[in-house]
Interface confidence: medium
């Protein structure tokens, strides 16, 4: 069995985690994909998932998490905006392929969010309000809440991440519904 590896990302409160999870294009382009958190002693918990089938370039938003599936590029983009210290933890991208077990995309991401002034929306002079708000009408994408922490035998391409500080605050609230909102082909 392949050993699950981790990549560590240390960010400050208010910053954005920008992760790209590569997948095999031909095989998984339209498969439903998800972003999960793995807490000690618990099964992975799905925080957000794409629609089923996954739609090209159309993001799904859950609170401060935005998923965007780029079929042409064979990657799932995950953004967690306006990070909080409580967001610290171990995360992973997975692909649902029922009736089989979810397919995990390596590496897992160890996110460490610390207190700090860098990029906290509203706390720096470059901060401006973003024009985007959560749309009043929503499309809900249903996704399983838990998946079994099964050992994976084949490692697909690893995920890569980019850290950025939002120059403008996206007006996201603590939303529990999954919201489809309009991103490239």
């Amino acid at each position: 069995a392949t050993k699950l590896t981790e990549e560590k990302y240390e960010l400050k409160e208010g910053q954005t985690l920008d992760v790209k999870c590569d997948y095999t294009l031909e095989k998984f382009a339209s498969s439903q994909k998800a972003w999960q958190i793995i807490r000690d002693g618990e099964m992975p918990k799905t925080l957000a998932c794409t629609e089923r089938p996954s739609k090209n370039s159309h993001p799904v938003q859950v609170g401060r998490i935005i998923l965007e599936d780029y079929h042409d590029h064979g990657l799932l983009r995950v953004r967690m905006v306006n990070l909080q210290v409580e967001d610290s933890g171990l995360y992973q991208c997975v692909i649902y392929q029922p009736p089989k077990e979810p397919h995990m995309l390596f590496d897992r991401i160890r996110l460490v969010v610390t207190k700090g002034f860098s990029g906290t929306p509203g706390s720096n002079e470059n901060s401006t309000q973003n024009v985007y708000k959560i749309p009043p009408t929503t499309t809900k994408a249903l996704c399983p809440l838990y998946t079994s922490p099964r050992t994976v035998t084949q490692a697909p391409p690893k995920s890569t991440a980019d850290v950025s500080t939002p120059d403008s605050e996206i007006n996201l609230t603590n939303v529990t519904d999954i919201i489809r909102v309009p991103v490239f082909n």
């Epitope: 159309h58 780029y70 590029h73 953004r79 024009v131 950025s164 939002p166 309009p182 991103v183």
Partner: antibody, heavy 119, light 107 residues
Framework: QVQLVQSGAEVKKPGSSVKVSCKAS????????ISWVRQAPGQGLEWMGG????????NYAQKFQGRVTITADESTSTAYMELSSLRSEDTAVYYC????????????WGQGTMVTVSS | EIVMTQSPATLSLSPGERATLSCRAS??????LAWYQQKPGQAPRLLIY???NRATGIPARFSGSGSGTDFTLTISSLEPEDFAVYYC?????????FGGGTKVEIK
């Protein structure tokens, strides 16, 4: 406040190429998408293509496929649009525009770059 | 590609009047439609996104409605600075496409 500042006007000969730059200042560059939209004199808006800097891969409208190249340099927060095999009908104002989602609306625009193609 | 058709091409109105601009998509674009205002020599400015949401700093006299294939931009009471060209844009599928524009001119 984020601003997109474009390079100056260009006059080109038919058959040549033009490369227009779009520099973002005052905020994050990588997490956004940058599109290029052109407007011929007295005409409407036409989306040419765009790029998400952290992906590095661009997407193009079919009409411009093979003739346009869109790139981004994260180190300088600058996006570029190069159009080759220019013809007189490419005479237009070329705008760069920022959007949070690739399939999204454009919230911040550059001032525009006039490209004139004339022999 | 999705063809966006705007009507009328020109709207002649007086300040204080109500302006109603129409935009029709050749196929459904859900609610993923934006409206822009453009004045001569200037870049377009985002007014409305996702059919009905006003962008930051846009006055309340501008409102958008519709979903699917038929959309409307309404300016409740025209101000002198509102005379301009207005474009709709769909951002539901690739390629992103714009309507041909509606010019709102002073009567």
């Amino acid at each position: 406040q984020v601003q997109l500042v474009q390079s100056g006007a260009e006059v080109k000969k038919p058959g040549s190429s033009v490369k227009v730059s779009c520099k973002a200042s005052g905020g994050t560059f990588s997490s956004y998408a940058i599109s290029w939209v052109r407007q011929a004199p007295g005409q409407g808006l036409e989306w040419m293509g765009g790029i998400i800097p952290i992906f590095g891969t661009a997407n193009y409208a079919q009409k411009f496929q093979g003739r346009v190249t869109i790139t981004a340099d994260e180190s300088t927060s600058t996006a570029y649009m190069e159009l080759s095999s220019l013809r007189s009908e490419d005479t237009a104002v070329y705008y760069c525009a920022r959007h949070w989602y690739a399939l999204g609306s454009f919230d911040i625009w550059g001032q525009g770059t006039m490209v004139t193609v004339s022999s | 590609e999705i063809v966006m058709t705007q009507s009328p091409a020109t709207l002649s109105l007086s300040p204080g009047e109500r302006a109603t601009l129409s935009c029709r998509a050749s196929q459904s674009v859900s609610s993923y439609l934006a409206w822009y205002q453009q004045k001569p020599g200037q870049a377009p400015r985002l007014l409305i996104y996702d059919s009905s949401n006003r962008a930051t700093g846009i006055p309340a006299r501008f409102s958008g409605s519709g979903s699917g294939t038929d959309f409307t931009l309404t300016i409740s009471s025209l101000e002198p600075e509102d005379f301009a060209v207005y474009y709709c844009q769909q951002h539901d599928v690739w390629p992103i496409t714009f309507g041909g524009g509606t010019k709102v001119e002073i009567k």
